[in-house]
């Protein structure tokens, strides 16, 4: 997989600051590169905008726990 | 339909008030926070106030800090500005918008209402 | 307050022109910048957010680039619908600004 090696890392250099609507949230990915000042985890919208946000906080813990569960429940 | 719809503008005199509205619908209104941006004529943008999904949060440009009040209604899907004390200076059209989130930043504007003109003139 | 100046304050270019234009902040933005389109009479309207994102169903020939102060919006091939005001606007701290704008005439 050459590609995914070589891909350029998406980096976060502030976080918002404001608590994101989880309805609002489709999925997010976790930025641990030793290439970027700092972890982060950045969030993909419904309408597939990125948000970098801090792991550290409550609400970034909690909606990524709610979008955990949201792709282990099979849909009907 | 995804839109704003703006109402309350007009002619005012100075040190007087007056209140626009903005109606949302085609989203969830609740989710996003809101700002006002405003233009005077002839003149480039100016953001003038937000709040944050909940109306907990807000925030202002100095110069209408203490005169101007932004508040929300998620139960009617509104926006509102309370201006008083108004000055020529505040002479200007007023747009309501929908406020992002950037990667590296908040506060950019994807849906815009089609602005109310606000005149401050004796 | 970030201060945003861009230049030049109005162009005349044709149908075709590759046109670029430029927004420098009076401090870092990181990539906390967004690009609007206004037509006379008419609200603004996103192209360009995060300094590069194109904004949903705006034409491929809008590009944004640039981080730190300087930033350019390029429009590959102008229309004629391009001929408008164009304003940036950073998003990386209070009170969010505006640029002065650049008017894009025919020539």
């Known amino acids: 997989q050459p590609d995914a090696i070589n891909a350029p890392v998406t980096c976060c250099y502030n976080f918002t600051n404001r608590k994101i609507s989880v309805q609002r949230l489709a999925s997010y990915r976790r930025i641990t590169s030793s290439k970027c000042p700092k972890e982060a985890v950045i969030f993909k919208t419904i309408v597939a905008k990125e948000i970098c946000a801090d792991p550290k906080q409550k609400w970034v813990q909690d909606s990524m726990d709610h979008l955990d569960k949201q792709t282990q429940t099979p849909k009907t | 339909e995804v839109q704003l719809v703006q109402s309350g503008g007009g002619l005012v005199q100075p040190g007087g008030s007056l209140r626009l509205s903005c109606a949302a619908s085609?989203?969830?209104?609740?989710?996003?926070?809101m700002s006002w941006v405003r233009q005077a004529p002839g003149k480039g943008l100016e953001w003038v106030a937000n709040?944050?999904?909940?109306?907990?949060?807000?925030y202002y440009v100095d110069s209408v800090k203490g005169r101007f009040t932004i508040s929300r209604d998620n139960a009617k899907n509104s926006l509102y500005l309370q201006m008083n004390s108004l000055r020529a200076e505040d002479t200007a059209v007023y747009f309501c918008a929908r406020d992002l989130e950037g990667l590296h930043g908040d506060g950019y504007f994807d849906l815009w209402g089609r602005g109310t003109l606000v005149t401050v003139s004796s | 307050a970030i201060q945003l100046t861009q230049s030049p304050s109005s162009l005349s270019a044709s149908v075709g022109d590759r046109v670029i234009l430029t927004c420098r902040a009076s401090?870092?933005?990181?990539?906390?910048l967004a690009w609007y389109q206004q037509k006379p009479g008419k609200a603004p309207k996103l192209l360009i957010y995060?300094?590069?994102s194109l904004e949903s169903g705006v034409p491929s020939r809008f590009s944004g680039s640039g981080s730190g102060p300087d930033f350019t919006l390029t429009i590959s091939s102008l229309q004629p619908e391009d001929f408008a005001t164009y304003f940036c606007?950073?998003?990386?701290?209070?009170?969010?600004?505006f640029g002065g704008g650049t008017k894009v005439e025919i020539k």
């Open positions: 606007q950073q998003f990386n701290s209070y009170p969010l600004t």
């Open positions: 995060d300094a590069s």
């Open positions: 401090q870092g933005v990181s990539s906390a």
């Open positions: 085609g989203f969830t209104f609740s989710h996003y926070w």
């Open positions: 709040i944050e999904q909940d109306g907990s949060e807000k």
